[in-house]
């Protein structure tokens, strides 16, 4: 559970946080779990512990393996394991999937690319960028703090991105680099002010009185995911959780695409054996999103039953 | 939401031990310490001691050692504080609380109702 | 053990009153807790690492302090915050309370 993988190049320095973390003021003890040695503390070893980080300056293909962090908290020790594996470095251009960090996606709105694990070095500005192997040029481009900045994202800007930068320690200068892969959202999203399609503003809906009735709350919120978007019935302005008659039920219906792209979404509203009480509530449904709340209000009238007498 | 339910109250001879429970629901059990802290009416609070669920690892002040006995059932998400030879100023409520995040110690975020165990003759 | 001294053990302030509690450690402790409690109930966390404020806590609490000495304060007493308050460290084992501050109002 509180095991990490970490991983790096050969010569190049590696510093791995411990997963447990702690109060700065915790002790933090390192062992290399195959042989439960002790890891130095001395700076001078090429290997060292430094509180909650283990550094490898540099790192060798021999330094892979377990690595166990014991914090010492004031009650109890507890105990995280680090993953450690260290690569040759390839030849090729090709970074293989194994040394690739997470994925991000970005759009002409947002396109930060973060440097992975940066924050665990003594670096300073500026990074170096690459995208496949190629040094990036150009006012597109923009190196600002941690992070990588695209101007105007296209689709052909998908790829894999690597990062180099210096560790500084003690005056003595490593090289990192890191790689992870950028993908374009090509789908431009939007959001507006909920627009209820049914039901209709004060609607009166024929029901038959024992029978069951279904009444469908469908609203859209524009195109795209929507951070927050949610339909639901009221029943006398209260929640129908809350407002305690079994009978009468909501349900989520299916995430609606229209053809046009907006994203809707459906709330069915299910009364069971429909009761003359019922003709007296006021049914509203609701749609609601960062922009604001439609209500449209809907009553129950009672539908005769077709006289089959001759 | 997290939530810790403890066992009713109790009254117990003094000699005897009585074992509250404490379910937790809400989060990943074997994630968190759980720590006891027990109240005398009218006093302030004290630190008896926690267990670790995924270990079963404890810790306890010292001055309860020997006394408090305290495990964790991890197919049910429950702790239990066990405490023996009970005496007359063993009568308190018995909190169980976790912290809110468990490896940085930010003070105890979540607590039980209490239960009142009462020693008397 | 690392002893913890609270003071006042009572006091009686006005609503709006600017209220300050001290706890005093008989040795060097890194962070300091402080929580509420009232009649019948568990207590409640209100400020955590000395200085920090628990979620859904009114920002009219606030804590301070370094070392041995700490400061609870409220900077407008409410009619709700009658209540016992308490400091707890978390440096050394055994994990200590202060004896608790009753605060009435007046």
């Known amino acids: 559970k509180f095991s990490k993988q970490s991983w790096g190049l050969e010569n190049e320095a590696l510093i791995v946080r411990c997963p447990r973390q702690g109060k700065p003021s915790y002790t933090v003890d390192w062992y290399y779990s195959q042989t439960n040695k002790s890891i130095p503390t001395q700076e001078r070893n090429r290997v060292f512990a430094s509180g909650q980080l283990l550094k490898f300056l540099p790192a060798a293909v021999a330094d892979s393996g377990i690595y166990t962090c014991i914090v010492r908290s004031p009650t109890f020790n507890r105990t995280g394991y680090a993953n450690v594996t260290i690569y040759k470095k390839q030849s090729d251009c090709n970074v293989p999937d194994y040394l690739m960090y997470s994925t991000v996606s970005g759009s002409e709105k947002n396109s930060k690319i973060y440097c992975p694990t940066i924050d665990l070095y003594n670096w300073t500005a500026p990074l170096e960028w690459f995208k496949n192997c190629q040094a990036l040029q150009g006012s597109r481009y923009r190196a600002h703090k941690s992070f990588l900045v695209i101007d105007n994202v296209m689709t052909e800007d998908a790829g894999d991105y690597t990062c180099k930068f210096i560790h500084n320690e003690n005056g003595a200068n490593y090289s990192v680099t890191a790689t992870r892969s950028f993908t374009v959202k090509d789908e431009q999203g939007f959001s507006l002010f909920p627009v209820i399609g049914a039901p209709a503003q004060n609607e009166i809906k024929e029901v038959e009185i024992g029978k069951n009735a279904n009444l469908t709350c469908s609203a859209c919120f524009g195109k795209g995911t929507q951070f927050l978007a949610a339909v639901l019935w009221q029943l006398n302005g209260t929640k129908i959780t809350d407002f305690g008659e079994p009978r009468i039920q909501q349900e989520e219906g299916q995430n609606q695409s229209f053809s046009n792209g907006l994203a809707c979404l459906d709330m069915v509203l299910r009364i069971a054996d429909v009761k003359e009480e019922d003709l007296l509530l006021q049914y509203d449904c609701l749609a609601l999103n960062l922009h604001g709340l439609r209500r449209h209000t809907v009553r129950l009238s009672r539908k005769n039953p077709i006289d089959h007498h001759s | 939401q997290v939530q810790l339910v403890q066992s009713g109250a109790e009254v117990k001879k003094p000699g005897a031990s009585v074992k509250v429970s404490c379910k937790a629901s809400g989060y990943t059990f074997t994630d968190s310490e759980m720590y006891w802290v027990r109240q005398a009416p009218g006093q302030g609070l004290e630190w008896m001691g926690a267990?670790?669920?995924?270990?079963?690892?404890?810790a306890f002040n010292q001055k309860f050692k020997g006394r408090v006995t305290m495990t964790a059932d991890k197919s049910t998400s429950t702790a239990y504080m066990e405490l023996s030879s009970l005496r007359s100023e063993d009568t308190a409520v018995y909190y169980c609380t976790r912290a809110f995040d468990n490896d940085n110690d930010e003070g105890f975020a979540y607590w039980g109702q209490g239960t009142m165990v009462t020693v008397s003759s | 053990d690392i002893q913890m001294t609270q003071s006042p053990s009572s006091l009686s302030a006005s609503v709006g009153d600017r209220v300050t509690i001290t706890c005093s450690a008989s040795?060097?402790?890194?962070?300091m807790h402080w929580y509420q409690q009232k009649p019948g109930k568990a207590p409640k966390r209100l400020i955590y690492?000395?200085?920090k404020l628990a979620s859904g806590v009114p920002s009219r609490f606030s804590g301070s302090g370094s070392g041995t000495d700490y400061t609870f304060t409220i900077s407008s007493l409410q009619p709700e915050d009658a209540a016992t308050y308490y400091c707890?460290?978390?440096?050394?084992?055994?994990?200590?309370f202060g004896q608790g501050t009753k605060l009435e109002i007046k």
């Open positions: 707890q460290q978390w440096s050394s084992n055994p994990l200590t």
């Open positions: 690492d000395t200085s």
């Open positions: 267990i670790d669920p995924e270990t079963g690892d404890t």
């Open positions: 040795s060097s402790v890194n962070y």
